[in-house]
Amino acid sequence: IVGGTNSSWGEWPWQVSLQVKLTAQRHLCGGSLIGHQWVLTAAHCFDGLPLQDVWRIYSGILNLSDITKDTPFSQIKEIIIHQNYKVSEGNHDIALIKLQAPLNYTEFQKPICLPSKGDTSTIYTNCWVTGWGFSKEKGEIQNILQKVNIPLVTNEECQKRYQDYKITQRMVCAGYKEGGKDACKGDSGGPLVCKHNGMWRLVGITSWGEGCARREQPGVYTKVAEYMDWILEKTQSSDGKAQMQSPA
């Protein structure tokens, strides 16, 4: 996160850190807890690393430097990448992770509410992006979870800024005209949340941007409301009940 500040314990209890353990262990992406056994993240996080065994998911943490070999983590039971996502394109950048074991909810580890299907009428004015990603383009992963308040921009405005790319209705953009505040490398897959009527909702999944926090280059996020049918379909349990935080 560029231009952000330190978060507090329990401020973003749905934020998780997706880490890979090969020879060393490192944070690669963020994610959002949406149910006892489900995390929502970006599909591009798994490019070149589709093996679920190498991933460790840390929830209920604030400081990455607090993680030791004894820190509990979740393992992946299943990675569900959107069927229309292609490595060679930038669309449908969304994936679900089913955890091997369900998580108990606590003050520091609980899910984010999802938006209603096709939510286009709600005007969100209080939106935040969080993550442990770089604090500048040529930066490094941060220890303490960062937060930054960023306004949404219209898709029309966003398209003007990214004429080389197609900004679809299944994307949402956020940023300041002057830049300075944005997500960055390592924040991918993490949440763009907005508070509306006293409730936080997961509006976007951190996907891409041209550099980080550059002037007139907003961040681009996967629009969660556009994928509610897909999320519901994939997270339905065998008894037909959705094991996730229902939309408000």
Epitope: D47, K86, S88, E89, K166
Partner: antibody, heavy 125, light 108 residues
């Protein structure tokens, strides 16, 4: 299976014209930026021109600007390169390629993931 | 224009040896826009590495890419007979998109 097949090459005199075609199959052509790259005999690769998915934006190397025109017909899944005022130095194998533009580490990527087999253009009197 | 300079021009190595190919750019290049291609005689180029370090589909893990900014490296950990040919680095950071002049890897 992604396939790109160039055609239209041949021998042409200096000052002459030629139109290259590249037939694409196995993917959604209208989603991808496409390019032409050439390789003079015994030399390296040179990017020639690119065109946006819709065809609305085109870019050219200085060496061909004003002489070559890139275009596409998404209904026919075909890419074109119209070459006018040809010179001896335009002699090369011309390849069409697909531009992949995915996402990695919260940034867009750009690379040429599929190439045609090439068509030889010889400009000589 | 961004100039791409590859070294060495030619690399003579035996099968099983390690090959290290260098690519230097005249300006900063975002790693996500740096790719490597392999070309064997009479064939079209083939994508090996994109984003400076990501292997393309079907490329064996003996190929690896590293680098940042202006210095990039392609490494072939153990040369196989099919690896001989010419290797090009290429940037799509800004137009004109440019290629290096190539490094030829030949059998010693």
């Amino acid at each position: 299976e992604v396939q790109l097949l160039e055609s239209g090459g041949g021998l042409v005199q200096p000052g002459g014209s030629l139109r290259l075609s590249c037939a694409a199959s196995g993917f959604t052509f209208s989603v991808y930026m496409m390019i032409w790259v050439r390789q003079a005999p015994g030399k390296g690769l040179e990017w020639v021109s690119s065109i946006s998915p819709s065809g609305g934006q085109t870019t050219y190397a200085d060496s061909v600007k004003g002489r070559f025109t890139i275009s596409r017909d998404n209904s026919k899944n075909t890419l074109y390169l119209q070459m006018n005022s040809l010179r001896a130095e335009d002699t090369a194998v011309y390849y069409c390629a697909r531009v992949a533009r995915g996402i990695a580490a919260r940034s867009r990527t750009s690379y040429f993931d599929y190439w045609g087999q090439g068509t030889l253009v010889t400009v000589s009197s | 224009d961004i100039q791409m300079t590859q070294s060495p021009g030619t690399l003579s190595l035996s099968p099983g040896e390690r090959a290290t190919l260098s690519c230097r750019t005249s300006q900063f290049v975002n790693s996500n826009y740096l790719a490597w291609y392999q070309q064997t005689p009479g064939q079209a180029p083939r994508l090996l590495i994109y984003g400076a370090s990501s292997r393309a589909t079907g490329i064996p893990d003996r190929f690896s890419g590293t680098g940042y900014g202006t210095d990039f490296t392609l490494t072939i950990s153990r040369l196989e007979p099919e690896d001989y040919g010419t290797y090009y680095c290429q940037q799509s950071s800004r137009t004109p998109w440019t290629f290096g002049q190539g490094t030829r890897v030949e059998i010693k």
